[in-house]
């Protein structure tokens, strides 16, 4: 199955790569812009120069293209924790990221919240916090495990999930997320 | 057995407001972040909001910033969604939900759905 391709790629598909074709004509092929600039002016004929004009701050192209504007920078969300891991220059978006210690939580494909790394008090450090997960704690005897924390089990109370973990027979509990809940 | 019960759907015109509650039983709301979830008609499950286990900290998606607000009362085990002036997009069935931090966009533990239908 051939799939389905929109106007413009099929526009490209029929230069060689790296050329689009001219949108008023399509018997012409004209150069791609390079990254980190956008297309001004459709080259006039084969073999002749399109006009491709760098981005202005604030904006970036990051691949070959034939944009007739540059994108424009993304901004870190600082009220999401996010910091500048590296400045947008023409040719690169701006590069988010999160502290030393923390990693991130994905609220939407493109939107992500930093938290701080569990230190596994009361208990150890079974998996180290990674980019997108945070630490792993396996608690000592006498404590479990909530919301990543261990916490002594004088705070469970009855009938709650935490009584499976803290029954006084287990010597040693490794905190477990509540059963069905994940 | 962890469940959770969502309340408050139903019909409103454009402009108009709803409430939805969220009853859980068989674990403690103030121990995690909990959130609402929706999923619009031939759509994909989305963030609405979400809210820390305290309350001092919350999540808005940006579509429902400064029209919808989210609350606990840990001591009902209870969570809620204020919706104002509600939009004809807004329309879909929300989810109460755990949230499970890390990584993403994950939708944990949810309930059945409450149904929100903005027409006039």
């Known amino acids: 199955l051939v799939p389905h391709l929109g106007d413009r790629e099929k526009r490209d598909s029929v230069c060689p790569q790296g050329k689009y074709i001219h949108p008023q004509n399509n018997s012409i092929c004209c150069t791609k812009c390079h990254k980190g600039t956008y297309l001004y002016n459709d080259c006039p004929g084969p073999g002749q120069d399109t006009d491709c004009r760098e981005c202005e701050s604030g904006s970036f192209t990051a691949s070959e293209n034939h944009l007739r504007h540059c994108l424009s920078c993304s901004k870190c969300r600082k009220e999401m924790g996010q910091v500048e891991i590296s400045s947008c220059t023409v040719d690169r978006d701006t590069v988010c990221g999160c502290r030393k210690n923390q990693y991130r939580h994905y609220w939407s494909e493109n939107l992500f919240q930093c938290f701080n790394c569990s230190l596994c008090l009361n208990g150890t450090v079974h998996l180290s916090c990674q980019e997108k997960q945070n630490t792993v704690c396996t608690c000592h005897a006498g404590f479990f495990l909530r919301e990543n924390e261990c916490v002594s089990c004088s705070n469970c109370k009855k009938s709650l999930e935490c009584t499976k973990l803290c029954l006084p027979q287990i010597e040693n509990v490794k905190g477990t997320e509540d059963s069905g809940t994940t | 057995e962890v469940q959770l019960l969502e309340s408050g759907g139903g019909l409103v015109q454009p402009g108009g407001s709803l409430r939805l509650s969220c009853a859980a039983s068989g674990f403690t709301i103030e121990w995690y972040w909990m959130g609402w979830v929706r999923q619009a008609p031939g759509k994909g499950l989305e963030w609405v909001s979400a809210i820390s286990g305290s309350g001092g900290s919350t999540y808005y998606a940006d579509s429902v910033k400064g029209r919808f607000t989210i609350s606990r009362d840990n001591s009902k085990n209870t969570l809620y969604l204020q919706m104002n002036s509600l939009r004809a997009e807004d329309a879909a069935v929300y989810y109460c939900?755990?949230?499970?931090?890390?990584?993403?966009?994950?939708?944990?533990?949810r309930g059945q759905g409450t149904l929100v239908t903005v027409s006039s």
């Open positions: 939900a755990k949230v499970k931090l890390g990584g993403g966009p994950n939708f944990g533990y």
